[in-house]
């Protein structure tokens, strides 16, 4: 959603669902910055590329970047 | 279940100040847009205004821009229209409707609306 | 802004008969379309959105279809409550959000 005048932040609802890591396509997580005083986590899924916003505070999203990261690390050499 | 309880509206005068509510419950309200749409009388459906789930983000339609302010209490389940310099052509019912927490915006449930009259 | 059309404004029908609702943007919405049926006195309720995906307890008699430009709700066989306004909705990524301005669907 786009960006007010002002504040250039992004998400206007945020998601508590669990996300599938089979699922998605790309995993973006914002920075708070001058711009946008909150931490942002943007999921694009396979299906659609439809996109969604995460909340950063909810437990299964936690869990999820957890296991992002652990599938990250067994990629890098 | 969802619910969305519409109120503070009335009869006023042009030029004239009102401010609406809208109590929700049933839900993680503190993760969830929240969106005023108006029909005015025997017309279609106008979206006025949105603020995001903290009430960083906020957008407004331009016919209602500089005069009318979105809040919420997140606190207390709370969203609030501040309508300043109110005009004749504002005569609607004003419907506090939830994000569909979607990218892409959606209202998946509304309030029972609530009428506000601006004449002289 | 995107402007949506609604047609026809009025449509005439009677229970059992099926209704098809035509919406049409003025530029492309990709399939991001909603549709609202509201009856007197009420607030619109969400049926479908993303074009074609029904809304939590909505009848399988409501079906919407189109991408692009061009979008269509129907309702395979009319019910007495389906007797109501329908709106059309582009949920763009950027505001405002805009409706149609309506079809009426009345008992013939």
């Known amino acids: 959603v786009p960006l007010s005048r002002t504040v250039r932040c992004t998400c206007i609802s945020i998601s508590n669902q669990p996300v599938n890591p089979r699922s998605l396509e790309k995993l973006e997580i914002i920075p708070a910055s001058q711009f946008c005083p909150r931490v942002e986590i943007i999921a694009t899924m396979k299906k659609k590329g439809e996109k969604r916003c995460l909340n950063p505070e909810s437990k299964a999203i936690k869990n999820l970047l957890k296991a992002v990261s652990k599938e990250m690390s067994k990629r890098s050499p | 279940q969802v619910q969305l309880v519409d109120s503070g509206g009335g009869v006023v005068q042009p030029g004239r100040s009102l401010r609406l509510s809208c109590a929700a419950s049933g839900f993680t309200f503190n993760t969830y847009g929240m969106h005023w749409v108006r029909q005015a009388p025997g017309k279609g459906l106008e979206w006025v205004a949105v603020i995001s789930y903290d009430g960083i983000i906020k957008h407004y339609a331009d016919s209602v821009k500089g005069r009318f302010t979105i809040t919420r209490d997140n606190s207390k389940n709370m969203v609030h229209l501040q309508m300043n310099s109110l005009r004749a052509e504002d005569t609607a019912v004003y419907y506090c409707?939830?994000?569909?927490?979607?990218?892409?915006?959606?209202?998946?449930?509304w309030g029972q609306g609530t009428l506000v009259t601006v004449s002289s | 802004e995107i402007v949506l059309t609604q047609s026809p404004a009025t449509l005439s029908l009677s229970p059992g008969e099926r209704a098809t609702l035509s919406c049409r943007a003025s530029?492309?919405?990709?399939?991001?379309v909603a549709w609202y049926q509201q009856k007197p006195g009420q607030a619109p309720r969400l049926l479908i959105y993303?074009?074609?995906n029904r809304a939590t307890g909505i009848p399988a008699r409501f079906s919407g279809s189109g991408s692009g430009t061009d979008f269509t709700l129907t309702i395979s066989s009319l019910e007495p409550e389906d007797f109501a306004i329908y709106y059309c909705q582009q949920r763009s990524n950027s505001p405002p959000w805009t409706f149609g301005q309506g079809t009426k669907v009345e008992i013939k």
């Open positions: 530029q492309s919405v990709s399939s991001y």
């Open positions: 993303d074009a074609s």
């Open positions: 409707a939830r994000d569909s927490s979607s990218w892409y915006v959606y209202f998946d449930y």
